[in-house]
């Protein structure tokens, strides 16, 4: 059965700046990746980025840079300033759509040991 992994990291150089990395462990070819925060995309989450292997990348603030790392993994950097910036307990979710298998998703947040006060 395919699986999705999610890693969330706070950047040491920039307070409240996050890097989200997601990957798909499965045999199918990826058709679309959707990254959201505040919960899964279909359950009240807000879309941050949509990545398509052929048709490009769409992203919305506070997403700063979304990119493919490999054919089956992506990364997303979030801006750290502004009213819409994430906080330490924000949940980030990644949904990978693979044809014809379907979609798999997983969510993650900053590990408890990551203290925003130490990130500067």
């Amino acid at each position: 059965t395919p699986e999705v992994w999610v890693q969330v990291r706070m950047e040491a150089t920039e307070l409240s700046s996050f890097t989200i990395r997601c990957g798909f462990l499965g045999s199918g070819s990826i058709s679309l990746v959707t990254v959201s925060w505040g919960g899964p995309n279909g359950a009240g989450g807000t879309t941050l980025a949509v990545l398509h292997p052929e048709r490009g990348i769409r992203q919305w603030a506070p997403a700063r840079q979304a990119r493919w790392e490999t054919q089956s993994s992506i990364s997303l950097i979030l801006e750290g300033s502004g009213a819409s910036s994430p906080c330490a307990n924000t949940t980030f979710c990644c949904k990978f759509a693979s044809f014809p298998e379907g979609s798999w998703e997983a969510c993650g947040s900053l590990p408890p040991s990551s203290d925003p006060g130490l990130s500067a």
């Epitope: 279909g42 014809p100 979609s103």
Partner: antibody, heavy 120, light 107 residues
């Protein structure tokens, strides 16, 4: 304008074979996943075959597995369904459909359908 | 396979009525739900994708809602051209499966 036009349907005896074709136009055929969906008289819709845009991945339900083969020819902008060992229960209108990645694999374009009748 | 149970199977209504069709999935299908309209002798047409997004050219009287396992298609004010059969579909896990259909008839 997106167009899908099926052909190849007709009357065939049980145990016989048919090859359905779907001619696509108005879009970049090679960029889309495609499917065949059938509808028995007065009944609902059933996916019978799907193929990924690169042609590497296919799907068949148990009802047709081993008897039906989906294929595509991107140079000819065509989708095919080879149907062997046909049974009375395969009698249906067969539709060719296009999946849109950005719509969660919803089928955003359909052909007009071609009727396959399996009867002695 | 994920089962999509649609209700009612048939429905009589009048022009101007508000109509609701429901679809229940046998397990969570995230937001990967679409709705189609089919008229006799014609191919299905996509109405709604991702639960609540209207496809190009679909009138605003059609709306979709729901999450997880329970989904709804609502027609706010029935027009004569809306009398047809409606199908829900999940595209979350293969095989994509459809509801059995709801036939909307004139009262």
């Amino acid at each position: 304008e997106v167009q899908l036009v099926e052909s190849g349907g007709g009357l065939v005896q049980p145990g016989g074979s048919l090859r359905l074709s779907c001619a696509a136009s108005g879009f970049t055929f090679s960029s889309y996943h495609m499917s065949w969906v059938r509808q028995a008289p007065g009944k609902g819709l059933e996916l019978v075959a799907a193929i990924s845009r690169d042609g590497d991945s296919t799907y068949y339900p148990d009802t047709v597995k081993g008897r039906f083969t989906i294929s595509r020819d991107d140079a000819e902008n065509s989708l095919y369904l080879q149907m062997n060992s046909l049974r009375a229960e395969d009698t249906a209108v067969y539709y060719c459909s296009r999946h849109e990645d950005y719509f969660g694999f919803a089928m955003d374009s359909w052909g007009q359908g071609t009727l396959v009748t399996v009867s002695s | 396979d994920i089962q999509m149970t649609q209700s009612p199977s048939s429905l009589s209504a009048s022009v101007g009525d508000r109509v609701t069709i429901t679809c229940k999935a046998s397990q969570s299908v995230s937001n990967d739900v679409a709705w189609y309209q089919q008229k006799p002798g014609k191919a299905p047409k996509l109405l709604i994708y991702y639960v609540s997004n209207r496809f190009t050219g679909v009138p605003s009287r059609f709306s979709g809602s729901g999450s997880g396992t329970d989904f709804t298609l609502t027609i706010s004010s029935l027009q004569p051209e809306d009398f047809a059969t409606y199908f829900c579909q999940q595209a979350y896990r293969s095989p994509w499966t459809f509801g059995q259909g709801t036939k909307l008839e004139i009262k």
